[in-house]
């Protein structure tokens, strides 16, 4: 005879256990039904009546078949450094995991209790163990023949470029600078290229910054030697550089004199307005292989007649160290221009948000038929000291930081050559001195 199916509640056979989804109630001494996930026991069973279940209230849950008198409370809302990967429902608890760039320093049964920012390796150190959801980055010094010039939680040390003739040997935090007798790129007259310390990590491609209306522009800014961008194969020899530099300086002086004369004549100018916008990029997006259209600053030897644009740009450089500039010992910069005190020998201390620097440089090149014009070239910067995400940086607030007395029209730069192609070209990365090169 087939055994009869017992309906709850029922008394179990001596020595046997209750069936699946049933529990033994000690008071009633009967096998009773459990409540399904999302429910709890409102009334416990008796010898004659089964368990009465009720749905969990808001912000409470039960994940398993149960006979608990009250549902469990969902965990507190996810903190700002976390992402809610599973919402609180009647059947499951909220799960918080660390957002990108952070790792779980203290885990709980499900999700994470405490997130911490991934360590950033400072220049001279590279990632030797990438961070994971549950482990921090490990930084190690760059081996001989390799370098890292970034403060990053993803960049590994990279080999120095190979030079035919080395101008400046590379070290752990700087690539080698090459020199050669014949230039491998066409140069604008009156200026010498020194490649800039732009990170050229192969494994990261830089997103295209917001398009700019600027044609390829050659600013003349004084700066010291620095490591090259990838693909830079050679520069002018020193004597040629000096000659060209002196020539440029002469032209600059003539231009300034012209300016003084022109300011006397009050004629309305026809101005070509050129804007070079340097968008703020998230820290780990602001690096990558430099495309052919990306621009490098042209340089002249520093002189007493350097314009206010030069000095303000230099001041900006000093004010806002970037990931591509080697930092002073104990201080590390992250991509958004933040500086942190270093707590370790081989890596940076974790830190939050820092100062974001948005630089907008506007140069008005003025021209009128009789060469007499009066206008001011303006370079303005938008700077925000925020703890918010990059997207919340103050875009619209424009704080002028310098005004040119007059922008002269050089023979080297006619309106036609300035306008060049009207197509919009991406500018590089938020690095004040990453510069421009002729396209």
């Amino acid at each position: 005879l087939p055994a009869q199916v017992a309906f709850t509640p029922y008394a179990p056979e001596p020595g046997s256990t209750c069936r699946l989804r049933e529990y033994y109630d000690q008071t009633a001494q009967m096998c009773c039904s459990k409540c399904s996930p999302g429910q709890h026991a409102k009334v416990f069973c008796t010898k004659t009546s089964d368990t009465v279940c009720d749905s969990c209230e808001d912000s409470t849950y039960t994940q398993l078949w149960n006979w608990v008198p009250e549902c469990l409370s969902c965990g507190s809302r996810c903190s700002s450094d976390q992402v809610e990967t599973q919402a609180c429902t009647r059947e499951q608890n909220r799960i918080c995991t660390c957002r990108p760039g952070w790792y779980c320093a203290l885990s709980k049964q499900e999700g994470c209790r405490l997130c911490a920012p991934l360590r950033k390796c400072r220049p001279g150190f590279g990632v030797a163990r990438p961070g994971t959801e549950t482990s921090d980055v490990v930084c190690k010094p760059c081996a001989p023949g390799t370098f890292s010039n970034t403060t990053s939680s993803t960049d590994i040390c990279r080999p120095h470029q190979i030079c035919n003739v080395v101008a400046i040997p590379g070290n752990a935090s700087m690539d080698a600078v090459c020199t050669s007798t014949s230039p491998t790129r066409s140069m604008a007259p009156g200026a010498v290229h020194l490649p800039q310390p732009v990170s050229t990590r192969s494994q990261h491609t830089q997103p295209t910054p917001e398009p700019s209306t600027a044609p390829s522009t050659s600013f003349l800014l004084p700066m010291g030697p620095s490591p090259p961008a990838e693909g830079s194969t050679g520069d002018f020899a020193l004597p040629v550089g000096l000659i060209v530099g002196v020539t440029a300086l002469g032209l600059l002086i003539i231009g300034v004199v012209n300016c003084v004369i022109m300011t006397q004549v009050k004629k309305k100018p026809l101005c070509l307005q050129r804007e070079a916008k340097v968008p703020h990029l998230p820290a780990d997006k602001a690096r990558g292989t430099q495309g052919p259209e990306q621009q490098h600053l042209l340089i002249t030897a520093p002189s007493s007649s350097s314009s206010s644009l030069e000095s303000s740009a230099s001041a900006l450089d000093r004010r806002a160290p970037t990931r591509n500039q080697p930092q002073a010992p104990g201080v590390e910069a992250s991509g958004a221009g933040e500086a942190r005190a270093s707590t370790g020998s081989s890596d940076s201390s974790p830190g939050g948000h820092g100062t974001q620097v948005n630089v907008t440089c506007i140069v008005n090149v003025c021209s009128s038929s009789d060469h007499s014009s009066q206008c001011s070239s303006q370079a303005s910067s938008t700077m925000g000291d925020t703890d918010s995400s990059p997207s919340e940086s103050p875009k619209d607030e424009q704080v002028p930081f310098s005004k040119e007395e007059c922008a002269f029209r050089s023979q080297l730069e006619t309106p036609e050559t300035l306008l060049g192609s009207t197509e919009e070209k991406p500018l590089p990365l938020g690095v004040p001195d990453a510069g421009m090169k002729p396209s």
Partner: antibody, heavy 118, light 110 residues
Amino acid sequence: EVQLVQSGAEVKKPGATVKISCKVSGYTITDFYIHWVQQAPGKGLEWMGRVDPEDGNTEYAPNFQDRVTITADTSTDTAYMELSSLRSEDTAVYYCSTWDGFSYFDYWGQGTTVTVSS
Amino acid sequence: EAVVTQSPATLSLSPGERATLSCRSSTGPVTTNNYANWVQQKPGQAFRGLIGGTNDRAPGIPARFSGSGSGTDTTLTISSLQPEDFAVYYCALWYRNHWVFGGGTKLEIK
């Protein structure tokens, strides 16, 4: 000059444990991870694991996880690889190395032959 | 567990020819997080790391060696084979917390 010098060949019985040493010189041991790689006769390379001598933290390949222990002694500039529960398929040459796809610090020991035979 | 497959197992070419060695990840696309590497082994000689970070030549490695990656594959190219390039080449991919080597490609003289 950077050198990694490994201990000599070993012959072991199945079920036994072998411990190979790797003495480094010419650089600061804590600056780079030390890896252990297995190469069975006529076979390719099998990454076993690595140790960070700075803090002793290790990472192991899933296939070796249960049987391998990699350590480093900074006082003697020596790394060790211990493989337990040996079986015949563990017969191989074992290399210690500072090779790392992250650092380009590329030095290898001369290899230690371990023969597992009953 | 991740499996890294190299192809071909053997490649027979003559000096001066171009060699293309492929390495495929079983777990989907090879990303920058796999930090793809290539290692050379010559009989009776120490191993030598050639490429790191998918396409960076290690210090001292000739320019004829280059690495690239797209989709599930990472590739080692030797533009013009020299007699000393005939060896076994291994690729290695990083998976979260461990390296996995491919089975190797033997590059032999035709």
